[in-house]
């Protein structure tokens, strides 16, 4: 029959080449002669000339070595025709398979596997999984099945077996309890990888196993006990760094220190955070100490970590024992901001008020007083009492130097320290108003004509508070009543002045009193310029000139 | 009638070169794979090279490796040799011979002399 | 390189005898080996291919026998055109070699 069962060929073959594989026979033969080819990749295509055939023999040859890790099956197609070139038989398939050897070593995918685990891992935790692959065949032989396993462990602590490797996946594993960061960081496991499902050939690669940190060491104050020693009413001040050790990892959480004030500090005067570098304690002053109301403190300081412990660990604290140092500290005036009331205008020499200042030292300083800063120069102060007395004329209705009734002087104090210090206080006099002027008219010129004049409304000021000022009372003198009128309004805050009989163009004086509801009476004259006009004007036409 | 001629030998000069030439007919010359045998003078047979059907691969034995070189023109039915850097014991009767059944040597010329002398 | 060790290197006989020449491989070549026949100042001639198949066109009274390392080629009645020299060549591994060659002349 026209048929070939499949042909098996070793790769790697020795030769000699060409070699024959099987002959193709038609039995068409008996009849006629038969002439043989074969066509397909491997033949009369890419790769070409691999397989060749006696056109008159029928022999099959092969002519180089075969490679089934390059091509592991070749499809032929033979041929047989007649002298006349007439095909005999169908196109027959011709199957080569390329048997495998192991011609090649099992290869790792990496020269160096990484892989990490947490210490203290239960026996059974996976660590990582490495690869080999080899090139040979796995399916219809062993040699290209891998079998994994562990050649060497340094360091050999705690023990030589602390992985193992699964033969066939590659994964490796914690095999016993004991792994220590702090103890042993880095396993390098030498892991082989050999054909033959571990009997053929062997290569080697090292699998590099971190042992991350688990926070498994509490950190511990070096020292315990600290002294230290702080100034009086300092705020932030650095009173003492703690430095703990800790194990674990640097710069890990389960290293970075978390402090917390346990006791000893009932007033919160103190913090304490963490340096990020040296991971040292920093306690500060939140608030001032005061040396008179406590000289000692003593803190108790515990530590633990960002992350909390794995297991549980005793917590390490210290005790720091804070000196307050006595500071000469300035006085102070009682209260800081000193509100009196004193009427403008009182007699110099008069008493204003005693502002005096306490020293919160606790020896008996003398202090020293004096005056700061007084705008107007109206007041004086006794150095030693604090007494303060008018040295000139209070006037609240000064626009340059009182504001809102109130005159601002700053006083200080001085202490007999060594050195001396000083403190300073406000005094705040509310000036309290006297009636010390009078109304006064505005404006005090006016323009007005001598026919049908309109009426000329003056306002009224008063520099002076209620009720030293409004309802106001209008009087003419000297005479002017006899040509004018003045009205105050009903509001009482305006004067209407009316001219009552004519007056010839000229300019005038209009005497006018006005009082204010204290009866203060001020008299200002008023220039009045009359015009040869009606109604209103506002300057006096020019003399008129015929034609 | 299959037949092989050979032709090309003669005197060369220690390391000169020579081509030898055969000649086939009678047979489908680009289905066979070929070769070349060589006798010394009262000595026994020595392969020499071997060229498959195609030409695409071509085998040696170390004693002629880089120095001879066998090929074939299919289209002119002709096997030729190549050979460079002659020396006194490549004397010799080369003789083509071709595969039979995939095996050696089926068929053989006639042989041409080759003498490498001074 | 395997080698091939013929023997006897020469051998005298009479018409009508039985001849028998030995060839030994230094390796296992299964049966990949040639008998040639070479008169003088002619080319050889393969009698016998896979240790034992006649070439088309050679008497039956050629036979070849043998397998691995030892093979032997017998000439069961030798005939006047039978003197000549007979080499053996393997072909089971390379470089392919041929035996040192038996003379056959007549007694």
């Known amino acids: 029959d026209w048929v070939v069962a499949p042909i098996s060929v070793p790769e790697n073959g020795k030769g000699p080449f060409p070699q024959r594989l099987n002959q193709l026979k038609s039995n068409k033969d008996r009849d006629t002669k038969i002439f043989y080819s074969i066509t397909g990749p491997g033949a009369d295509s890419p790769p070409e000339g691999v397989f060749a055939v006696e056109k008159e023999t029928g022999w099959l040859l092969l002519n180089k070595p075969l490679d089934r890790e390059e091509i592991a099956k070749y499809e032929l197609f033979g041929h047989a025709v007649s002298e006349n070139g007439a095909s005999v038989e169908d196109p027959m398939n011709i199957s080569i398979i390329v048997t495998d050897q192991n011609d090649h070593k099992p290869k790792f995918t990496q020269d160096t596997f990484r892989g990490s685990v947490l210490e203290g891992v239960l026996p059974g935790t996976s660590v990582m999984q490495v690869t080999a692959t080899d090139e040979d065949d796995a399916i219809y032989t062993y040699n290209g099945v891998v079998a994994y396993s562990i050649h060497s462990q340094e360091p050999k602590d705690p023990h030589d077996l602390m992985f193992t490797i699964h033969r066939s996946t590659g994964t490796i594993s914690v095999i016993s309890s004991g792994l220590d960061r702090e103890k042993v960081p880095e396993y390098t496991l030498t892991i082989q990888a050999t054909d033959m499902d571990g009997d053929g050939s062997t290569t080697t690669a090292v699998a590099v196993v971190e042992i991350l940190d688990a926070n498994d060491n509490a950190p511990m104050f070096d020292p315990q006990k600290y002294e230290a020693h702080v100034p009086e009413n300092a705020v932030g001040h650095e009173v003492q760094r703690l430095t703990v050790t800790d194990l674990d990892a640097p710069n890990s959480p389960a290293w970075r220190a978390t402090y917390l004030i346990m006791g000893g500090d009932d007033g919160d005067h103190f913090t304490i955070t963490t340096h990020p570098e040296s991971n040292q304690g920093i306690l500060t002053t939140r608030k001032g100490l005061d040396f008179e109301a406590k000289n000692q403190h003593t803190l108790y300081v515990e530590v633990t970590n960002e992350a909390p412990f794995v297991l549980k660990l005793p917590t390490s604290t210290a005790t720091i024992v804070v000196h307050v140092e006595d500071v000469n500290e300035a006085p102070v005036f009682v209260p800081p901001s000193k509100v009196v009331e004193v009427q403008e205008g009182i007699p110099t020499g008069e008493p204003v008020c005693v502002y005096t200042a306490e020293d919160p030292d606790k020896e008996n300083q003398k202090i020293s007083y004096r005056i700061l800063r007084d705008p107007a120069g109206w007041l004086a102060m006794d150095p030693d009492s604090g007494q303060v007395t008018a040295v000139g004329t209070l006037d609240r209705e000064d626009e340059q130097f009182v504001r809102n009734n109130i005159y601002e002087v700053m006083v200080l104090a001085m202490d007999n320290g060594s050195p001396p210090t000083t403190g300073t206080g406000t005094l705040l006099l509310t000036l309290i108003d006297v009636n010390d002027h009078g109304p006064v008219p505005e404006p005090r010129q006016i323009t007005i004509c001598n026919q049908s004049p309109v009426r000329q409304v003056l306002n009224i000021t008063d520099k002076d508070l209620s009720p030293h000022t409004s309802p106001f009372q209008a009087q003419l003198t000297d005479d002017s009543d006899i040509y004018w009128t003045a009205e105050v309004n009903e509001e009482g805050d305006t004067v209407v002045l009316s001219l009552k009989k004519f007056l010839k163009q000229d300019t005038y004086d209009v005497h006018l009193s006005l009082s204010d509801h204290g009866n203060k009476e001020q008299l200002t004259v008023i220039r009045a310029t009359v015009c040869d006009c009606h109604g209103h004007v506002e300057t006096c036409p020019g003399p008129w000139k015929g034609g | 009638e299959v037949q092989l001629l050979e032709s090309g030998g003669g005197l060369v000069q220690p390391g000169g070169s020579l081509r030898l030439s055969c000649a086939a007919s009678g047979f489908t010359f680009s289905s066979y794979a070929m070769s070349w045998v060589r006798q010394a003078p009262g000595k026994g047979l020595e392969w020499v090279s071997t060229?498959?059907?195609?030409?695409?691969?071509?085998y040696y034995p170390d004693s002629v490796k880089g120095r001879f070189t066998i090929s074939r023109d299919n289209a002119k039915n002709t096997l030729y040799l190549q050979m460079n850097s002659l020396r006194a014991e490549d004397t010799a009767v080369y003789y083509c011979?071709?595969?039979?059944?995939?095996?050696?040597?089926?068929?053989w010329g006639q042989g041409t002399l080759v003498t490498v002398s001074s | 390189d395997i080698q091939m060790t013929q023997s006897p290197s020469t051998l005298s006989a009479s018409l009508g005898d039985r001849v028998t020449i030995t060839c030994r491989a230094s390796?296992?070549?299964?049966?990949?080996l040639i008998w040639l026949q070479q008169k003088p100042g002619k080319a050889p001639k393969r009698l016998i291919y896979d240790t034992s198949s006649l070439d088309s066109g050679v008497p039956s009274r050629f036979s070849g026998s043998g397998s691995g390392t030892e093979f032997t080629l017998t000439i069961s009645s030798l005939q006047p055109d039978d003197f000549a020299t007979y080499y053996c060549l393997q072909y089971g591994s390379s470089p392919l070699t041929f035996g040192g060659g038996t003379k056959v002349e007549i007694k």
């Open positions: 060229i498959s059907s195609g030409g695409h691969y071509t």
């Open positions: 390796q296992d070549i299964g049966i990949n």
């Open positions: 011979a071709s595969y039979y059944y995939g095996i050696p040597f089926g068929y």
